[in-house]
């Protein structure tokens, strides 16, 4: 009789977790007798699979009956494979003894699971900034087999080069994770603008997943100030009105100071957005000339979504004031906004009025 | 190791039935075909019939085929014989063997049952 | 059906001394180049013990004094060196189409 030897015709099988797999062995003689044992991996440390004699493996069955006549055909089918299942599957023939004794082993095939990455996950900085600055997105993606992965980042639809993408691990394991950090500049016109992270892999038949961040998240929009005196009203009342425009988000609070003293503190609320996703607001003070002999300091003061106050003062000159006119002119806007934002960016905003 | 544990001795009445029991153990029941031999006092071995017990598939020896019956009951891993309408000849030793290569041979026996049949 | 006839019934052999038992079909065991014919051993209120396997094959466990040759029709079960423990019946059986077993040789010693 010729020599036993064990096939196993498969190097490799890719099989999509969910899937089942069959991997196929059959031995050339019937000699000697004994039971054949699956193995994931080889040496010492290998793992039992399938044995033909005894266990119970649940998500193992044989292909062919085993009962069957001079049944030499040892294949086996595992259901619901997992990234877990990966590995080298090796059958091994036994001769039958107390305990069995190994005879041979096939060549071992290549088991490799297709797994789908996760939804991207895409995350922004943990404070907000302004405009110019550049600030960092994250996207994460897990589970994925096999390796190669493409990531691709995008800015209201336009391709973005700035980032950089890491796959772990490095060596081969059952799944993998990708975690990619972009770099973006914001732009005052960026609070309806969108990231989006686009993962493209070999199980998602070219329909990539995508993770998306609303750069509103990201952004801070601070506002620009401007102090104004409107006509006079009736007898001794000036108007004066602070116009808070296009700032973002909404968290804003505007303080009325007469001559350093807090005359009135208001909270922007339900406030309608412009088209470019920012806010404006206008608060106005009526200031009763008559009850001042000097010239009264307003000064109109913002804190803008926690960050440090700014001012814009305005001196109403109580000696212009005839009882009988008003003018607009005859009150001198001596204010500057007196911001101590450390943000550079901030300083061009002066230049707006 | 593989074990094949009979039921014990028993004495029938001609005409009578009797159920032999095997109860399998040391490796998977239902991969291996469970064979029925039988030996007279002082005679050879007569083998009676085999039973897959995956799929309860049986082939039986001509002379036997109208009295034996080969049953398996998978959860317990027990191989059951039961011959019909005994005669005084009948009268043997009975084995339950199992074929570990699937060659139709018997590797593995029981200590066997001794049916007696008299009147 | 496959008749299985051995020779001699019984046979007697000094210690030490080979012994052969012979078995012969009524019609060929052979196929897929395998002879399916195995031989047993059985001992006085034993069951029986599997020797040989497919004509050639020691089973587990088998001394190597034991062997088994033959094609086609005519097998020989040959013990090289007889030791006392050996004595038993030897029964052949083929598995070609479904089993039978020889009328069984036994072994003594003289």
């Known amino acids: 009789e010729e020599e036993l030897q064990v096939i196993q015709p498969e190097k490799s099988v890719s099989v999509a977790a969910g899937d089942s797999a069959t991997l196929n062995c059959t031995v050339t003689s019937l000699i000697p007798v004994g039971p054949i044992q699956w193995f994931r991996g080889a040496g010492p440390g290998r793992e039992l699979i399938y044995h033909q004699k005894e266990g119970h493996f649940p998500r193992v069955t044989s292909v062919s009956e085993s009962t069957k006549r001079n049944n030499m055909d040892f294949s086996i089918h595992i259901s619901n494979i997992t990234p877990a299942d990966a590995g080298t599957y090796y059958c091994v023939k036994f001769r039958k003894g107390s305990p069995d004794v190994e005879v041979k082993s096939g060549a071992g095939t290549e088991l490799s699971v297709r797994a789908k990455p996760s939804a991207p996950v895409v995350s922004g900085p943990a404070v907000r900034a302004t405009a110019e600055h550049t600030v960092s997105f994250t996207c994460e993606s897990h589970g994925f087999s096999p390796r190669d992965i493409t990531l691709k980042w995008f800015k209201n639809g336009n391709e973005l080069s700035d980032f950089q993408t890491n796959v772990d691990p490095a060596g081969k394991s059952v799944s993998y994770s990708i975690r990619s950090t972009a770099r973006v500049v914001l732009t005052r016109r960026d609070v309806h603008s969108q990231v989006i992270c686009e993962v493209a892999h070999v199980t998602l038949q070219g329909d990539p997943l995508r993770g998306t961040a609303n750069l509103s998240e990201a952004i801070r929009v601070p506002p620009f100030l401007e102090v104004t005196q409107q006509s006079m009203r009736a007898d001794n009342q000036v108007n004066v009105t602070c116009q808070v425009t296009k700032f973002y988000p909404q968290r804003l609070q505007l303080t009325w100071l007469e001559n350093g003293n807090v005359s009135r503190t208001e909270m922007a609320s339900a406030l309608p957005e412009n088209k470019d996703g920012t806010y404006n607001w206008t608060s106005w003070l009526l200031v009763n000339v008559s009850a001042h002999r000097d010239d009264v300091k307003l000064t109109c003061q913002v804190e803008h979504d926690g960050q440090p106050a700014v001012n814009k003062s305005f001196s109403v000159k109580v000696s212009a004031h005839p009882k009988e006119q008003g003018s607009n002119t005859a009150a001198e806007n001596t204010g500057t906004n007196e911001r101590d934002y450390k943000d550079d960016d901030d300083k061009h905003h002066h230049h707006h009025h | 190791q593989v074990q094949l544990v009979q039921s014990g001795a028993e004495v029938k009445k001609p005409g009578a039935s009797v159920k032999v029991s095997c109860k399998a153990s040391?490796?998977?029941?239902?991969?291996?075909?469970i064979n029925w031999v039988r030996q007279a006092p002082g005679q050879g071995l007569e083998w009676i019939a085999m039973i897959d017990p995956s799929d309860s598939e049986t082939h039986y020896n001509q002379i036997f085929k109208d009295r034996a019956t080969l049953t398996t009951d998978t959860s317990t891993s027990t191989a059951y014989m039961e011959l019909r309408s005994l005669r005084s000849d009948d009268t043997a030793v009975y084995y339950c063997a199992m074929d570990y290569g699937s060659l139709y041979a018997m590797d593995y026996w029981g200590r066997g049952t001794l049916v007696t049949v008299s009147s | 059906d496959i008749v299985l006839t051995q020779s001699p019934d019984s046979l007697a052999v000094s210690l030490g001394e080979r012994a052969t038992i012979n078995c012969r079909a009524s019609k060929s065991v052979s196929s897929s180049g395998y002879n399916y014919i195995f031989w047993y051993q059985q001992k006085p209120g034993q069951p029986p013990k599997l020797l040989i396997y497919l004509a050639s094959n020691l089973d587990s466990g088998v001394p190597d004094r034991f062997s088994g040759s033959g094609s086609g029709t005519d097998f020989t079960l040959t013990i090289s060196s007889l030791q006392a423990e050996d004595v038993a019946v030897y029964y052949c059986q083929h598995s070609r189409e479904l089993p039978t077993f020889g009328q069984g040789t036994k072994l003594e010693i003289k």
């Open positions: 040391g490796y998977t029941f239902t991969n291996y075909w």
